[in-house]
């Protein structure tokens, strides 16, 4: 049967994104509907048709565009996404003798991890911190030299969508870190990145 | 040139099943959607369903409650249409068309199919 | 499914005459709407689509108008070839439908 051809996409905050949708049929549609989806029913984002052109709905007149002016291919691009814009998108293709075809394609909105590593001595003891802020929510490990050093993490979710992972290390003999490299491994989104920290007697 | 060339003219009998073909020559078979619309004598034209022959797609009128079966030669580009469980008010002509998008641009001769016992 | 309902359901006019076919659609089909020719024995013709756009090699005496319920088919200058009988077609909603037709006969 007649279909359409979606790809969801994973942008960063505050970056352009774009969305495509593909009909696989001989014929191209009469008129292209492009909706957000909503818990209740859709909500209209755009039109593009040969009659009327591009009509955005005032909701999305600085928002969005349609990029790909095809009643066959159709791409609409966000300039510059907020967390508001995350979701799933319909797009309709209202088609001579088939009626309407419809794809979805979902945006995932992403920030980067913003990373803090310092560490700090109590007298027997010595605090390592790693704290990883991120969307959606990274996770914190320890690659330390020697075995059997405990940690605690703490997970806090922010209004803003991001959510921060705070790991501590806690290091019961001190003196013998002196000088050593303890590093702190972020991994968000399958990428894992390293953060290095030599502890240095102050 | 473009042309759509219909089968000829069948008497059936009630109850019978009728296979209409529709060759079609001159343009690329599988670019336009083929129709057919039937025409019983005195009355208006009946809109009976179409098929996409690059993906084999169709859509039926259920006014004829699966009676009618809309299929594609693409190697032959040929179209067929048949209808089963004939009865007296199918007498009709039946026409196929072409049309890209909503855009009807050539038809076949027609075909009349008699139902008579 | 979506009725159409043409009138005149037959008309009498002469060669020059100015003609005007009316559609209606019992609901909303937006321009989704073709208008045809039909000759004793022979095919249909397509004459305009999407309400208003003329089909390549129609004459331009052919004009078609009209969205959502309302649809108009003017024949500017009739001509002795005109004389046929002619159809409305929606096909916004699936049962695409015709209208009754409209005889045009010579007065």
């Known amino acids: 049967q007649v279909q359409v051809v979606t790809q969801d996409e994973r942008e960063q905050l505050y970056t352009p994104a774009s969305l495509k949708c593909s009909l696989q049929n001989a014929q191209e549609a009469l008129i292209v509907t492009w909706q957000k989806k909503k818990a209740v029913s859709p909500e209209n984002m755009v039109t593009f048709s040969e009659n009327h052109g591009v009509v955005i709905q005032p909701a999305y007149k600085d928002k969005i565009n349609i990029t790909q002016l095809g009643l066959q291919n159709s791409t609409i691009t966000f300039w510059n996404i907020t967390l508001e814009d995350e979701g799933c998108y319909m797009c309709l293709f209202n088609t001579f003798g088939f009626g309407k075809i419809s794809g979805t394609a979902c945006l995932t909105v992403y920030v980067q991890p913003i990373v803090s590593l310092h560490y700090k001595f109590s007298e027997d003891h010595l605090n390592i911190t790693c704290s990883a802020t991120a969307r959606p929510a990274p996770m914190v490990f320890w690659k330390v030299p020697r075995s059997g050093i405990e940690n605690s993490t703490v997970t806090l979710s922010h209004p803003n969508g991001t959510t921060s992972v705070t790991s501590i290390l806690h290091i019961k003999d001190p003196k013998n870190q002196v000088g050593k490299e303890v590093i702190c491994q972020v991994l968000h989104l399958g990428t894992v990145t390293d953060f290095k920290q030599t502890v240095n007697k102050g | 040139q473009v042309q759509l060339v219909q089968s000829g003219a069948e008497v059936k009998k009630p109850g019978a099943s009728v296979k209409v073909s529709c060759k079609a020559s001159?343009?690329?078979?599988?670019?336009?959607?083929i129709l057919w619309v039937r025409q019983a004598p005195g009355q208006r034209l009946e809109w009976m369903g179409h098929?996409?022959?690059?993906?084999?797609?169709?859509n039926y009128n259920l006014k004829f409650k699966g009676r009618v079966t809309i299929t594609v030669d693409t190697s032959a580009s040929t179209a067929y249409m048949e209808l089963s469980s004939l009865r007296s008010e199918d007498t009709a002509v039946y026409y196929c068309?072409?049309?890209?998008?909503?855009?009807?641009?050539?038809w076949g001769q027609g075909t009349l199919v008699t139902v008579s016992s | 499914d979506i009725q159409m309902t043409q009138s005149p359901s037959s008309l009498s006019a002469s060669v020059g005459d100015r003609v005007t076919i009316t559609c209606k659609a019992s609901q909303d089909i937006n321009s989704y709407l073709s208008w045809f020719q039909q000759k004793p024995g022979k095919a249909p013709k397509s004459l305009i689509y999407?309400?208003?756009r003329l089909v390549d090699g129609v004459p331009s005496r052919f004009s078609g108008s009209g969205s959502g319920t309302d649809f108009t088919l003017t024949i500017s200058s009739l001509q002795p070839e005109d004389f046929a009988i002619y159809y409305c077609?929606?096909?916004?909603?699936?049962?695409?439908?015709f209208g009754q037709g409209t005889k045009l006969e010579i007065k």
């Open positions: 077609l929606q096909y916004d909603e699936f049962p695409y439908t």
């Open positions: 999407r309400a208003n």
């Open positions: 068309a072409r049309s890209k998008r909503d855009y009807f641009d050539y």
């Open positions: 001159g343009y690329s078979f599988t670019d336009y959607i």
């Open positions: 098929i996409d022959p690059y993906y084999g797609s169709s």
